[in-house]
């Protein structure tokens, strides 16, 4: 029979709040042995996933989204959901991420919600988190 | 994609995928994917190229096909037990997982494996 | 398992036309859809991810729209250059990456 998959938890750092221009973490915990943990974003219509997942007690393991400079795109509700195979989790509650004008701080009426939250692992300048889509037309990337 | 060619059945063969322009340590998926003559695409199976290096496999490929990767650039799809029905050409392809959506933005040129005595 | 089923397995359009091309699954798989065109001899390429994003460099001819288990690709404005087969794809990851049949677009 397989075991029942204890529901993740999300949580932000340094808070819910943040600064237009600064960064943000979202932390997913889980129960050890999770594979996979995805970040969703506004009901499942997106999702970050990253198996670098580290354990952060004997009985949990988690994973860390990091967005290096938020913006107002990246305003919204996320919630955790881990793959611990053979199976999916359900989802964490939502996390409500609010980002707040800087005085004199660039407007970002960016309609995408921003690609950034990756692995804190991961390093920044890698078009799997930039904000555009990868393009094989952007850089001279071949798979042979 | 490398390795292609001819194979008698039940025999194996190794197909290798080898990435430029950007490195594993970016934490992709690498999937490889294959099409029998003047049929559709299958999935077979991705890796993770971070440092956990999780499989999945289609559960049709699971047992028979195999994924694994080198830390730099490099990914290889083990076949064994070849029949007529694995005939097809196979392409290594990039999957990227962020919030502008999950889908395969990079392909290869795709290599043709015939399983034929 | 999940199941992408394509209809139709091939259409016929004249230039100028308007051709569309329904993706159905057999659960739920929100909005983690992609569509694909391929061309004989050549590997696939993203049209739409997301169900209804525009992959970079597609022509807005190219619609994407759906969610949960019924999905449409529409190709309005039809030119030659159309002509391929189209697939669908579940990108939910785990072993959920499952490609539809495929629709071949002849171009009249």
């Known amino acids: 029979q397989e075991e029942d998959l204890p529901r993740p938890s999300i949580s932000a750092e340094p808070g819910t709040v943040i600064p237009l221009g600064s960064h943000v973490t979202f932390v997913c915990r889980g129960p050890v042995g999770v594979q996979t943990f995805r970040l969703e974003r506004d009901s499942r219509s997106t999702y970050n996933d990253t198996e670098d997942v580290s354990q952060a007690s004997p009985s949990e393991s988690e994973a860390r989204f990091r967005i290096d400079s938020v913006r107002e795109g990246n305003a919204g509700l996320y919630r955790c959901i881990y793959y611990k195979p053979p199976k999916w989790s359900e989802q964490s509650d939502y996390l409500e991420l609010l980002v707040k004008e800087s005085s004199g701080g660039p407007d970002s009426p960016d309609t995408e919600p921003g690609s950034s939250a990756g692995p804190t692992q991961r390093p920044s300048d890698n078009s799997h988190n930039e904000h555009a889509p990868a393009s094989q037309g952007l850089k001279a990337e071949h798979l042979y | 994609e490398s390795g292609g060619g001819l194979v008698q059945p039940e025999g194996s063969l190794t197909l290798t995928c080898t990435a430029s322009g950007f490195s594993f340590s970016n934490s992709y998926y690498m999937c490889w994917v294959r099409q029998a003559p003047g049929k559709g695409l299958e999935w077979i199976g991705c890796i993770y190229t971070g440092s956990s290096s999780g499989t999945y496999y289609a559960s049709w490929a699971e047992g028979r096909f195999t994924i694994s990767k080198t830390p730099s650039t490099t990914v290889t799809l083990q076949m064994t037990s070849l029949t007529a029905a694995d005939t097809a050409t196979y392409f290594c392809?990039?999957?990227?997982?962020?919030?502008?959506?999950?889908?395969?933005?990079?392909w290869g040129p795709g290599t043709l494996v015939t399983v034929s005595s | 398992e999940l199941v992408l089923t394509q209809t139709p397995a091939s259409v016929e359009a004249a230039v100028g036309g308007t051709v569309t091309i329904k993706c159905q699954a057999s659960?739920?798989?929100?909005?983690?859809l992609a569509w694909y065109q391929q061309k004989p001899g050549q590997p696939p390429k993203v049209l739409i991810y997301k169900a209804s994003t525009l992959a970079s460099g597609v022509p807005s001819r190219f619609k994407g729209s759906g969610s949960g288990t019924e999905f449409t690709l529409t190709i309005s404005d039809l030119e030659c250059a159309d002509a391929a087969t189209y697939y669908c794809q579940n990108n939910n990851g785990g072993s959920d990456n499952t490609f539809g049949g495929g629709t071949e677009v002849v171009v009249k």
């Open positions: 392809s990039r999957k990227l997982t962020n919030f502008n959506g999950a889908y395969l933005d990079l």
């Open positions: 659960q739920s798989i929100y909005s983690y």
